[in-house]
């Protein structure tokens, strides 16, 4: 019988996002079927018109895949028989952002979920002293970020105090002139406490911690997704 | 450590009944399907039957088909294969296997004997 | 249904040799064929799965080669722990067939 007399399979996505220039993941995962023969996976891009991705068979079926994504998706062939349909697609592009759709056909019949993908650029930020300022002073710099993010300083000693009076930021855009380097200074740092410089976007959330004391500098770093249901 | 752990052979008249069980541990047992596989003594191996994570998908071999059941409860982490009808030539030692891409963990083995 | 015909059915070699141990199914099952080593006694160990991707903790002599309806395992330097039968199994779709084996003997 035809898939119209078939049973709704369930499928599920996550929300995610994908850094500018690296290799990002789509993820999607269904009830898998024991074996790969009936197994159809296709990945489609709302307003584009080929698909992203099509696997059946066993193995990747690309001829109706849209000029925007050749040569740059994969499924994780080996996994697709347990159940994962993830997309791997590298070399993210700004324009890769939007809404997708994940399409899972099996023997006891199909299903989908659409997953919102956002782009942009985010990294790691890392904190130093400069000792080539005049006063105490820290340097918190991160190489990649898109949008353009917030920075605030934060303190474990004064705990909600307000840093932008003694602190300042700048934003210098890299060579592919989409992405930017941030760079913050904080001033009038004082010893024995832990400083914060916190770069946010509205995908990205990274944190730089340093913890300075007369003995010993401990850094910190910590960078999160955001609206991603992981 | 990931471990399956197959219970219930032994020896039984033809046309008898036999359910056999497989106890997971180690793993996240919902989340995997799980696969019946048989050795005759002295031969080689054979599929039996399969089962989807959630049992949305169950498959037998035709040499089994209408004569063995194959179930799962997920929430005792535990894999059954119910034999109806046996025959002589279901002698073998039957494994549990976990399904992946390919039979990724496997049980120690069951040994069904069906003779008169 | 899918047969998958394995050869040789038995071979003979000695510790240090290079292994090639071929499977033939009768259609094409992509890459979805795993390798198994089972010893006497044993439950049979996978080897190799997606035809080419080595399992966690299998040695690197171990390899796996083929996709359509042609496969190897190789072993590049025979052990004497490698001494054993050795299966391929398809499960591109049921059903699930595995080879007739090929049981590897000390020379």
């Known amino acids: 019988f035809g898939i119209s007399g078939r049973h709704s399979i369930t499928v599920t996505t996550v929300a995610s996002a994908g850094n500018i220039g690296e290799d990002g993941i789509l993820s999607c995962t269904f009830e898998p079927d024991i074996k790969l023969s009936d197994i159809v996976i296709q990945w489609l891009k709302e307003g584009v018109l080929g698909l992203v991705h099509e696997f059946k068979e066993g193995k990747d079926e690309l001829s109706e895949q849209d000029e925007m994504f050749r040569g740059r998706t994969a499924v994780f062939a080996d996994q697709v028989i347990v159940g994962n349909a993830s997309l791997r697609l590298k070399n993210v592009q700004l324009t890769d952002a939007g809404t997708y759709k994940c399409y899972i056909i099996t023997s006891k019949g199909k299903g989908n979920a659409n997953l919102e993908y956002k782009t942009g650029a985010f990294s790691m930020p890392e904190v130093n002293v400069d000792y080539n300022a005049s006063s105490e002073t820290l340097r918190c710099e991160a190489p990649r970020w898109f949008p353009q993010p917030t920075v605030v300083w934060a303190s474990q000693v004064d705990q909600g105090a307000n840093f932008s009076e003694v602190s300042n930021t700048s934003f210098e855009l890299n060579s592919e002139n989409v992405t930017m380097k941030v760079v913050s200074v904080l001033y009038n740092v004082t010893i024995n406490n832990t400083y914060s410089c916190m770069i946010e976007n509205d995908i990205a959330k990274a944190t730089g911690d340093i913890k300075v004391t007369e003995s010993e500098i401990k850094r910190r770093s910590h960078l999160q997704l955001l609206n991603s249901k992981a | 450590e990931v471990q399956l752990l197959e219970s219930g052979g032994g020896l039984v008249q033809p046309g008898g009944s036999l359910r056999l069980s497989c106890a997971a541990s180690?793993?996240?047992?919902?989340?995997?399907?799980m696969h019946w596989v048989r050795q005759a003594p002295g031969k080689g191996l054979e599929w039996v039957a399969s089962i989807s994570s959630s049992s949305g998908y169950i498959y037998y071999a035709d040499s089994v088909k209408g004569r063995f059941t194959i179930s799962r409860d997920n929430s005792k982490n535990t894999l059954y294969l119910q034999m109806n009808s046996l025959r002589a030539e279901d002698t073998a030692v039957y494994y549990c296997a976990r399904a992946s891409s390919g039979m990724d963990v496997w049980g120690q083995g069951t040994t069904v004997t069906v003779s008169s | 249904d899918i047969q998958m015909t394995q050869s040789p059915s038995s071979l003979s070699a000695s510790v240090g040799d290079r292994v090639t141990i071929t499977c033939r199914a009768s259609q094409s099952v992509s890459s979805a064929v795993a390798w198994y080593q089972q010893k006497p006694g044993k439950a049979p160990k996978l080897l190799i799965y997606?035809?080419?991707i080595r399992e966690s903790g299998v040695p690197s002599r171990f390899s796996g080669s083929g996709s359509g309806t042609d496969f190897t395992l190789t072993i590049s330097s025979l052990q004497p722990e490698d001494f054993a039968t050795y299966y391929c199994q398809q499960y591109y779709s049921t059903p699930l067939t595995f080879g007739q084996g090929t049981k590897l003997e000390i020379k």
């Open positions: 997606a035809a080419s």
């Open positions: 180690g793993f996240t047992f919902s989340s995997y399907g």
